[in-house]
Amino acid sequence: TPEVWVQVQMEATELSSFTVHCGFLGPGSISLVTVSWGGPDGAGGTKLAVLHPELGTRQWAPARQARWETQSSISLALEDSGASSPFANTTFCCKFASFPEGSWESCGSLPPSSDPGLSAPPTPVPILRADL
């Protein structure tokens, strides 16, 4: 069964910067990836980015840069302009549309124990998997 993983990281150097990593484990050709926050797109969540393998990407604030990391994974850099860090308590969702299998989506958030001062770059952040 195809699966989607979501990983949220706070940048150690900039407390206001976050990166969402999402990947698709399964067959088929990925046609579209939609990233949202506050819940799934269409269910109260707000769209942050849409990535198409051929036609490029579209992103909306506070998304800073959306890009493909591999043929089946993407990353989205976010810039938190506020003094506090609302991203820390936010759910991020990724939906992968693969033809002709269909769509799979998962949501994840920053692990509660995340301390940017202690997380060195090589340390892997737990992957949160939850097929909605």
Epitope: G28, S29, S31, G42, H52, L55, A97, F99
Partner: antibody, heavy 120, light 107 residues
Framework: DVKLVESGGGLVKLGGSLKLSCAAS????????MSWVRQTPEKRLELVAA????????YYPDTVKGRFTISRDDAENTLYLQMSSLKSEDTALYYC?????????????WGQGTSVTVSS | SIVMTQTPKFLLVSAGDRVTITCKAS??????VAWYQEKPGQSPKLLMY???HRFTGVPDRFTGSGYGTDFTFTINTVQAEDLAVYFC?????????FGGGTKLEIK
């Protein structure tokens, strides 16, 4: 203007074969996933075959698996459906349709349909 | 496969009425639901995608809502030209499946 024109339908004997064609124009055919959808005499719609834009991935429901084959020729801008071992329940109006990635794979263009009647 | 149960099968309404068609999926289909209109003698035409997004040229009297398993399609102020069969469609998981259709007739 996007245009899909099906052909190849007709009257065929039980167990016979037929090849449907769909000529596409007005868009970059190679950039789109395509499908064949049929409408039964009872007016129900059923997906019978789908093919990805690169032609590498195909899908068939169990009702036609092993009997129908979808293919595409991007140089000719044409979609095909090879049907064999036809059954009476394959009698339907067959539509060629285009899937739009940005619309959640909704079918944003359909042809006018070609009729297939399987008789005993 | 996912079953899309569409109700009602028939609707007889007067011009100017408000019409509501519902579609219930046998499992969650997220927001990957489209609605099509098939006028007599014509092929189906896309009206709505991602539940509530109107396709190009579709009048704003057509609206859609829902998420997960329950979806609603509404025609506000029905017009004579809306005489057609309407189908819901899930494109969330293969095989893409359709509702049984709702035939709208105008008095």
């Amino acid at each position: 203007d996007v245009k899909l024109v099906e052909s190849g339908g007709g009257l065929v004997k039980l167990g016979g074969s037929l090849k449907l064609s769909c000529a596409a124009s007005g868009f970059t055919f190679s950039s789109y996933h395509m499908s064949w959808v049929r409408q039964t005499p009872e007016k129900r719609l059923e997906l019978v075959a789908a093919i990805s834009r690169d032609g590498d991935s195909t899908y068939y429901p169990d009702t036609v698996k092993g009997r129908f084959t979808i293919s595409r020729d991007d140089a000719e801008n044409t979609l095909y459906l090879q049907m064999s071992s036809l059954k009476s329940e394959d009698t339907a109006l067959y539509y060629c349709s285009r899937h739009e990635d940005y619309f959640g794979f909704a079918m944003d263009s359909w042809g006018q349909g070609t009729s297939v009647t399987v008789s005993s | 496969s996912i079953v899309m149960t569409q109700t009602p099968k028939f609707l007889l309404v007067s011009a100017g009425d408000r019409v509501t068609i519902t579609c219930k999926a046998s499992q969650s289909v997220s927001n990957d639901v489209a609605w099509y209109q098939e006028k007599p003698g014509q092929s189906p035409k896309l009206l709505m995608y991602y539940v509530s997004h109107r396709f190009t040229g579709v009048p704003d009297r057509f609206t859609g809502s829902g998420y997960g398993t329950d979806f609603t399609f509404t025609i506000n102020t029905v017009q004579a030209e809306d005489l057609a069969v309407y189908f819901c469609h899930q494109a969330y998981r293969s095989p893409w499946t359709f509702g049984g259709g709702t035939k709208l007739e105008i008095k």
